[in-house]
């Protein structure tokens, strides 16, 4: 349960996260399991520990083995194991199965291929993408943040996709590649003009001054995976991020659910420590996709607090 396989190619950077999480963690110590020898934290070393992360800059075949991480806190020490294998670079184009990350599926409407493990690295856009070793070119392919988007996906788009990026550590650059298979599934989906399920139009939401309040904007957009669909909140017609009130935040990321086969999204607006002035604002739940935009407006009203313990 607390062991994780990691792999990489020689002369590339490899960064491994400790499979145990601290709750909380104060320090993390790393050891070579075979020798119980501590891994240094000084960055001048080719292999060094940096908190939850173990860094091979760059990796060598001889680094293969099991590494122990101990997440320390006053209450508990939690032990995890990272099983690291470093492979020699292949001279031919084929990527062997043991170097492949999990397969992802896509369809005409959803063709995102995420670059595996990239979140562990200090990288800057753009990513380079290859399919079966050929650099991807043409307007159908768009490298966006940490993923590749393929427009108008066809069955011929199935194959092995490799992302390549540069990890920067203290001014030194290291190459990283990661490969995963992409399969195309035929999806009989459709999209509709957005339908907002909550809140109701012109809904009045009762809140208590000084307490926290949550507003959920929930909308459905059709059947199957939707390529372009979003829900968001606006305050007095302004984006939450531009409104500049730190107490009022949208929940990061949109939750996707499938209700009766319908593709739905919801976004929670969290208002901390509700103030009188919040009652004067207009809260707009917006749902938009390729068909257009729908808006439902909510206002807050004061609820008389019932005396109770927290």
């Amino acid at each position: 349960k607390f062991s994780k396989q990691s792999w990489g190619l020689e002369n590339e950077a490899l960064i491994v996260r400790c499979p145990r999480q601290g709750k909380p963690s104060y320090t993390v110590d790393w050891y070579y399991s075979q020798t119980n020898k501590s891994i240094p934290t000084q960055e001048r070393n080719r292999v060094f520990a940096s908190g939850q992360l173990l860094k091979f800059l760059p990796a060598a075949v001889a680094d293969s083995g099991i590494y122990t991480c101990i997440v320390r806190s006053p209450t508990f020490n939690r032990t995890g194991y990272a099983n690291v294998t470093i492979y020699k670079k292949q001279s031919d184009c084929n990527v062997p199965d043991y170097l492949m990350y999990s397969t992802v599926s896509g369809s005409e409407k959803n063709s995102k291929i995420y670059c595996p493990t990239i979140d562990l690295y200090n990288w800057t856009a753009p990513l380079e993408w290859f399919k079966n070793c050929q650099a991807l070119q043409g307007s159908r392919y768009r490298a966006h943040k940490s993923f590749l988007v393929i427009d108008n996906v066809m069955t011929e788009d199935a194959g092995d996709y490799t992302c390549k990026f540069i990890h920067n550590e203290n001014g030194a650059n290291y190459s990283v590649t990661a490969t995963r298979s992409f399969t195309v599934k035929d999806e009989q989906g459709f999209s509709l003009f957005p339908v907002i399920g909550a809140p109701a139009q012109n809904e009045i939401k009762e809140v208590e001054i000084g307490k926290n309040a949550n507003l959920t904007c929930s909308a459905c957009f059709g059947k199957g995976t939707q390529f372009l669909a979003a829900v968001l909140w606006q305050l007095n017609g302004t984006k939450i991020t531009d409104f500049g009130e730190p107490r009022i935040q949208q929940e990061e990321g949109q939750n996707q659910s499938f209700s009766n086969g319908l593709a739905c999204l919801d976004m929670v607006l969290r208002i901390a420590d509700v103030k009188e002035e919040d009652l004067l604002l207009q809260y707009d739940c917006l749902a938009l996709n390729l068909h257009g935009l729908r808006r439902h407006t909510v206002r807050l009203s004061r609820k008389n607090p019932i005396d109770h313990h927290s």
């Epitope: 709750k23 909380p24 104060y26 320090t27 006053p74 209450t75 508990f76 939690r78």
Partner: antibody, heavy 118, light 112 residues
């Protein structure tokens, strides 16, 4: 909003045992440690111990070893504290409190009042 | 055990003015990782304690920025810049550096 719902007030006889419960909602109980704290007018807030619900590992204050036993049930998202060989000194309000990613005592239950009286 | 020392009652303050209270630990709460494991909690009358400040100077989620905290390894101060009626209660400092975790005896904030 993370909630910790504690069991109701208890009145028990000296020498008896009692089990207090703390039900976690809106998060997975195995994700964070659960701590228990005692509060009395005389001694204020005292840390009793903690449990890691993921593994069942426990840590206790020396003052409460043999007095408190901490357990957790993942299926019901509930943490328990059993107090044994009760005396009037054990009369107090007991709180459960969960840790967060970066710190302890992030949120607290509403407290359970325990009265030990003959 | 690390002993946390607080004054029992702060000087009564007027609403809208600032208030401060101190806390002292019997051992430095500065960890080798660079973090100072000093915490402040507020317990309002009839309620559970609630986290205000973690790791000496970080404001917990939802806590107004009227609250701030500073200190060295052993001496700490909690400051409330504009006291409101809802700030009334007992303020506890606590250490999470090592077991057993310990709390101060609390400082009661009173309004004039």
């Amino acid at each position: 909003q993370v909630q910790l719902q504690q069991s109701g007030a208890e009145v028990v006889r000296p020498g008896a045992s009692v089990t207090l419960s703390c039900k976690a909602s809106d998060y997975t109980i195995t994700d964070y440690e659960m701590h228990w704290v005692k509060q009395t007018p005389v001694h204020g807030l005292e840390w009793i111990g903690a449990i890691d619900p993921e593994t069942g590992d426990t840590a206790y204050s020396q003052n409460f070893k043999g007095k408190a036993t901490l357990t957790a049930d993942e299926s019901s998202s509930t943490a328990y504290m059993e107090l044994s060989s009760l005396t009037s000194e054990d009369s107090a309000v007991y709180y459960c409190s969960r840790s967060a990613t970066d710190y302890y005592f992030a949120s607290w239950g509403q407290g359970t009042t325990l009265t030990v009286s003959s | 055990d690390i002993v946390m020392t607080q004054a029992a009652i702060s000087n009564p303050v007027t609403l809208g003015t600032s208030a401060s209270m101190s806390c002292r630990s019997s051992k430095s709460l500065l960890h080798s990782n660079g973090i100072t494991y000093l915490y402040w909690y507020l317990q309002k009358p009839g309620h559970s304690p609630q986290l205000l400040i973690y790791q000496m100077s970080n404001l917990a989620s939802g806590v107004p920025d009227r609250f701030s905290s500073s200190g060295s390894g052993t001496d700490f101060t909690l400051k409330i810049s504009r006291v409101e009626a809802e700030d009334v209660g007992v303020y506890y400092c606590a250490q999470n550096l090592e077991l057993p975790f310990t709390f101060g005896s609390g400082t009661k904030l009173e309004i004039k």
